[in-house]
Amino acid sequence: MDVFMKGLSKAKEGVVAAAEKTKQGVAEAAGKTKEGVLYVGSKTKEGVVHGVATVAEKTKEQVTNVGGAVVTGVTAVAQKTVEGAGSIAAATGFIKKDQLGKNEEGAPQEGILQDMPVDPDNEAYEMPSEEGYQDYEPEA
């Protein structure tokens, strides 16, 4: 089995992983996730992109097999998706305009898009950050 199969990204029945949010509570909406608001970037059959998911099902330490590894601390939101569109939303977090394109010292960061598009398939290629958009890469 090819360990690079994007295990969650093209599931027919669409179990979509949503990264835990930090800093904002909303524990009631998100059940027992650690820190709250869930962002889901997959399309449903109706073609609606879900932003904030207020699903409180099965949020306690979900464990999902992904590409030969185990991911914990994410919340599985069960919903049917268009075949092939049940992708992981690596694009999570609250955006503040003044946080874009800045490094730790506040200097503009090279090579970063000012409006980074949502790429629901990105987790197959990048380790996702649930912390949002602020950038930390002092390149000494």
Epitope: D2, V3, F4, M5, K6, G7, L8, S9, A19, E20, T22, K34, E35, V66, G67, G68, A69, V70, V71, T72, G73, V74, A90, A91, T92, G93, E104, Q109, G111, I112, M116, N122, E123, A124, Y125, E126, M127, P128, S129, E130, E131, Y133, Q134, D135, Y136, E137, P138, E139
Partner: antibody
Framework: EVQLLESGGGLVQPGGSLRLSCAAS????????MSWVRQAPGKGLEWVSA????????YYADSVKGRFTISRDNSKNTLYLQMNSLRAEDTAVYYC???????????????WGQGTTVTVSS | QAVLTQPASLSASPGASASLTCTLR?????????IYWYQQKPGSPPQYLLR?????????GSGVPSRFSGSKDASANAGILLISGLQSEDEADYYC?????????FGGGTKLTVLG
């Protein structure tokens, strides 16, 4: 100066447990995803586990899932690896390593510690 | 089952160039993978050299000489670490690494010998 200092290694019998620690300094610890990477004697590098900056997401290699637990205490700038049900094949030097966050992603590890040796033998 | 394949060894003369390959077996889009390269000398931890996704998205590690550069061969699904002007201190093990769907993966490593 960036420093990652691992500790907690040692000799343990098969089936036993160890807890590794990694003390970080010289960078914004909470903004880095941290990983444990190991290297068996004479072998290559093997990624073991990773944890996001807030600790909200953790990742494990198949070879250790269900036995190892990664965690972090950002108030202490410390990373941990709790290793249970240890096997002979877990014998290795264990490195603590970190990768910076940018936007929605974490980069790979660009900061590495010197490593701590774990020997599992009866 | 290796997903990142590196030749076990490579040797070259001082002053020459060495091209280290890292072949990626993947069902994903090769162009989207960011390939990391590390150097490790005996008794020392790995050191980050560089990462390469494209000419527009690459990064050289702090203090890493420009003799070290990254590229990709899309036709072979391979990442390439090019070391030009080889020096005796370049003799080391070199590892590539990528992230894919919930895990970091390392190649098996290439032992580079600088002859002479």
């Amino acid at each position: 100066e960036v420093q990652l200092l691992e500790s907690g290694g040692g000799l343990v019998q098969p089936g036993g447990s160890l807890r590794l620690s990694c003390a970080a300094s010289g960078f914004t610890f909470s903004s880095y995803a941290m990983s444990w990477v190991r290297q068996a004697p004479g072998k290559g590098l093997e990624w073991v586990s990773a944890i996001s900056g807030s600790g909200g997401s953790t990742y494990y290699a198949d070879s250790v899932k269900g036995r190892f637990t990664i965690s972090r205490d950002n108030s202490k700038n410390t990373l941990y690896l709790q290793m249970n049900s240890l096997r002979a094949e877990d014998t290795a030097v264990y490195y603590c390593a970190g990768g910076a966050r940018r936007g929605r992603i974490y980069y790979g590890m660009d900061k590495w510690g010197q490593g701590t040796t774990v020997t599992v033998s009866s | 089952q290796a997903v990142l394949t590196q030749p076990a060894s490579l040797s070259a003369s001082p002053g020459a160039s060495a091209s280290l390959t890292c072949t990626l077996r993947s069902s994903g889009d090769f162009s989207r993978y960011r390939i990391y390269w590390y150097q490790q000398k005996p008794g020392s931890p790995p050191q980050y050299l560089l990462r390469y996704k494209s000419d527009a998205d690459k990064h050289q590690g702090s203090g890493v000489p420009s003799r070290f550069s990254g590229s990709k061969d899309a036709s072979a699904n391979a990442g390439i670490l090019l070391i030009s002007g080889l020096q005796s201190e370049d003799e080391a093990d070199y590892y590539c690494m990528v992230w894919s769907s919930g895990a970091w993966y390392f190649g098996g490593g290439t032992k580079l010998t600088v002859l002479g």
